[in-house]
């Protein structure tokens, strides 16, 4: 579904320097869907259109990234650009729907982290070690503290998984790597199940 990424990039490259700056500021305050994290301000403000497109896609995936870009552009009064994205969204929506059939076959090829969400929530006990491995590189300070503030291991893991929808493959791989180091037998068990 690379079309969505290309469409976001086209839209952002059509913005003037001031408009791109305004887009970033609005992105810092726009209401996000439950479970999605915010791109860190420091990194965001330094990005050009290409970097920002990559960041939007890695944080929010293509579908929601496209929707979010449309929302911000509308907030800025740039209806025309938003409409162009709407067209792309509708076209790529049909492609996405076709690609997701049959669901059974794709479910098994999902990332380990997504496949075994329930088991990981139930069985990971050393959550602090996992959090430490993800601090900064995957989890912001606020996310890290929010997970650690939960009282039980299950609640901590549930909170951690609430951030997963905004993660890219690298982030999920980092979590898997941390789990392999801290709970090697659990990972082996789940991989064989």
């Amino acid at each position: 579904m690379g079309r969505a990424r290309d469409a976001i990039l086209d839209a952002l490259e059509n913005l003037s320097g001031d408009e791109l700056k305004k887009f970033k500021m609005k992105l810092l305050t726009v209401q996000l869907r439950e479970g999605y994290g915010r791109i860190p301000r420091g990194a965001l403000l330094q990005m050009d259109a290409i970097d920002l497109t990559d960041k939007l896609v890695s944080y929010y995936l293509e579908s929601y990234g496209l929707e979010l870009t449309m929302t911000v552009l509308r907030d800025m009064g740039l209806q025309e650009l938003a409409e162009q994205l709407q067209t792309t969204k509708e076209e790529s929506g049909a492609v996405a729907a076709a690609a997701s059939v049959p669901a059974q076959s794709t479910a098994r090829t999902g990332h380990f982290v997504d496949q075994h969400r329930q088991a990981l929530i139930a069985r990971v006990t050393e959550v602090d070690g996992v959090l430490d491995a993800l601090h900064g590189s995957v989890l912001t300070e606020g996310q890290y503290q929010a997970v650690r503030a939960e009282t039980t291991s299950q609640d901590k893991m549930r909170k951690l998984f609430s951030f997963v929808p905004s993660w890219n493959l690298t982030c999920k791989d980092s979590l898997l790597q941390a789990l392999k180091e801290i709970h090697p037998y659990l990972v082996m068990d789940l991989e064989q199940s």
């Epitope: 860190p40 420091g42 990194a43 070690g129 430490d132 590189s137």
Partner: antibody, heavy 118, light 111 residues
Framework: EVQLQQSGAELVRPGSSVKMSCKTS????????ITWVKQRPGQGLEWIGY????????EYNEKFKDKAALTSDTSSSTAYMQLTSLTSDDSTIYFC???????????WGQGTTLSVSS | DIVLTQSPASSAVSLGQRATISCRAS??????????MHWYQQKPGQPPKLLIK???TLESGVPARFSGSGSGTDFTLNIHPVEEEDTATYYC?????????FGGGTKLEIK
């Protein structure tokens, strides 16, 4: 062997800015964060802030938010700290260090001495 | 901010004896799994060197005469038996929350 090599001593005028560097080697730069620490002569250590160079994520000690700006260049495996609106109070030694798991600092640079004088 | 109070400020210990340095945090820096307290040694003209992380885990290459203990708010660094090369200033550091803070330091002298 992990090494952090900091730039040389700086002598600058009050009110000006300075950008010091911390060149790393011996490990994958983007897998770790870099933190910066201030130490006045004969005194303790003060945490300034950190940058996770893989994603540019930064956090600062509130005290240094308007003083320090942390950046990095992955192509040269180098972290930078820019200090602005310099005063004599900024004259001291600054260390960079690598952030290990648990946010302890396992490898340190040799320090950069900053002198602010008119 | 969490304040770390080290004691004593300075200490003179005879060669071969035990040196004990204390670090007290103004609030707990421990979970059920880990204590986010670390210890460093700094010699004059040199950067600090990590000795112990997570309150009690000895860093690779650090002699076994160094040990750390404690949880919650009270932590201790022990050196036994002390050697001449242990003359230095020792700092504790927490990484529980921002801002990360260091203790005021303990200057250790070997008699």
């Amino acid at each position: 062997e992990v090494q952090l090599q900091q730039s040389g001593a700086e002598l600058v005028r009050p009110g000006s800015s300075v950008k010091m560097s911390c060149k790393t080697s011996g490990y994958t730069f983007t897998n770790y964060g870099i933190t910066w620490v201030k130490q006045r002569p004969g005194q303790g250590l003060e945490w300034i802030g950190y940058i996770y160079v893989g994603n540019g994520y930064t956090e600062y000690n509130e005290k240094f938010k308007d003083k320090a700006a942390l950046t990095s260049d992955t192509s040269s495996s180098t972290a930078y700290m820019q200090l602005t609106s310099l005063t004599s109070d900024d004259s001291t030694i600054y260390f960079c260090a690598r952030i290990a798991q648990g946010r302890c600092f396992d490898y340190w640079g040799q320090g950069t001495t900053l002198s602010v004088s008119s | 901010d969490i304040v770390l109070t080290q004691s004593p400020a300075s200490s003179a210990v005879s060669l071969g004896q035990r040196a004990t340095i204390s670090c007290r945090a103004s609030q707990s820096v421990s979970t059920s799994s880990y204590s986010y307290m670390h210890w460093y040694q700094q010699k004059p003209g040199q950067p600090p060197k990590l000795l112990i992380k997570y309150a009690s885990t000895l860093e690779s290459g650090v002699p076994a005469r160094f040990s750390g203990s404690g949880s919650g708010t009270d932590f201790t660094l022990n050196i036994h038996p002390v050697e001449e090369e242990d003359t230095a200033t020792y700092y504790c550091q927490h990484s529980w929350e921002l801002p990360y803070m260091f203790g005021g330091g303990t200057k250790l002298e070997i008699k």
